[in-house]
């Protein structure tokens, strides 16, 4: 009765700020009636909490039940296969899911031109699920940094990189005209979190943006 089914081979989190998704791989030769039970353990409480008895997808959004992630010691999750009265052993995430596992992203990057400079403003993530007091800048209150990559179009795909310590930055274009494309990757100097490069944001610079001075 107990453990005739094979266990899910792998279970892991992919998480961004207040967007915490658990993923797992299916058991071999699963049937149409195979589903997956998901349970969660909060460090410090040490008892497993059943979250879903029968998920037929291979991922589960745990954001709503891990809202205190940024003020806790973290979580572990486990998944097992269920088929009728049969179930597998549990497969547990092999790392603690904590704030360190959250991939850092930016909400967006806004560009404008002023007197030959490209002025950039990094919008921080504002997820709907985040409690009102848990803003990105309150959770990561110090040492926020951003790597900036600039590409000129047309160009030979060479990049200029710079690191800034503020959400506002300026890029000198050295009098060049054309399209400039910018990407941003966030980091926190005091933490080990991975960062995701933003999607490219582009702006066109023409002669009209330069002020002539004698």
């Amino acid at each position: 009765h107990g453990t005739e089914l094979p266990s899910p081979p792998s279970v892991w989190f992919e998480a961004e700020f207040f967007h915490h998704i658990l993923h797992w791989t299916p058991i071999p030769n699963q049937s149409e009636s195979t589903c997956y039970e998901v349970a969660l353990l909060r460090y410090g409480i040490e008892s497993w909490n059943s979250i879903s008895n029968c998920s037929q997808t291979l991922s589960y959004d745990l954001t709503a039940v891990t809202l205190d992630l940024y003020h806790s010691n973290g979580y572990r999750a486990r998944v097992r296969a269920v088929d009728g009265s049969r179930h597998s052993n549990w497969t547990v995430t092999n790392t603690r899911f904590s704030v360190d596992e959250v991939t850092l992203t930016v909400g967006s990057v806004n560009l404008e031109i002023h007197n030959g400079f490209i002025l950039g403003k990094i919008q921080l993530p504002r997820p709907k699920m985040a409690p009102a007091n848990d803003t990105y800048e309150s959770i990561f209150s110090h040492f926020r940094e951003y790597e900036i990559a600039i590409r000129k179009v047309p160009g030979n795909f060479t990049f200029t990189h710079k690191k800034v310590k503020h959400e506002n930055f300026s890029l000198l274009t050295s009098g060049e005209v054309g399209e400039f494309c910018v990407q941003v990757k966030p980091s926190v100097a005091s933490r080990s979190n991975k960062g995701m490069w933003s999607k490219e944001e582009c702006i066109s610079l023409t002669r009209q943006y330069f002020t002539v001075t004698n």
Partner: nanobody, 124 residues
Framework: QVQLQESGGGLVQAGGSLRLSCAAS????????MGWFRQAPGKEREFVAA????????YYADSVKGRFTLSSDNAKNRIALQMNSLKPEDTAVYYC?????????????????WGQGTQVTVSS
């Protein structure tokens, strides 16, 4: 600028094999994983296979399980799809994609970067 470049498509007889490759270029390439989708004429784009960098695991559509094998390199910017025992119903344009969002590996909306596609034709 991130670009995905596919290669390896072509015409093959039913029962034959093909190997598709995909390389991501660009110093600002970030992804949770990479995968393949396909689109046959008049049909929706459908999931074929994907790999997760964090989980180190692969996913396959039921229709290709046991016939297709997805592999990747250690640098996490190149994948290959070995397609064996090909069937006429595998005929489609195959697209390489990079998973940019944390949601399901099976949903095209989780992928932000796409290649131009490579044609695979399986004749009976």
């Amino acid at each position: 600028q991130v670009q995905l470049q596919e290669s390896g498509g072509g015409l093959v007889q039913a029962g034959g094999s093909l190997r598709l490759s995909c390389a991501a270029s660009g110093r600002t390439f970030s992804s949770y994983g990479m995968g393949w989708f396909r689109q046959a004429p008049g049909k929706e784009r459908e999931f074929v296979a994907a790999i997760s960098w964090i989980g180190g695991s692969t996913y396959y559509a039921d229709s290709v399980k046991g016939r297709f094998t997805l592999s990747s390199d250690n640098a996490k910017n190149r994948i290959a799809l070995q397609m064996n025992s090909l069937k006429p119903e595998d005929t489609a344009v195959y697209y390489c994609a990079a998973k940019y969002y944390t949601d399901s590996y099976f949903a095209a909306t989780s992928y932000a970067y796409w290649g131009q596609g490579t044609q695979v034709t399986v004749s009976s």
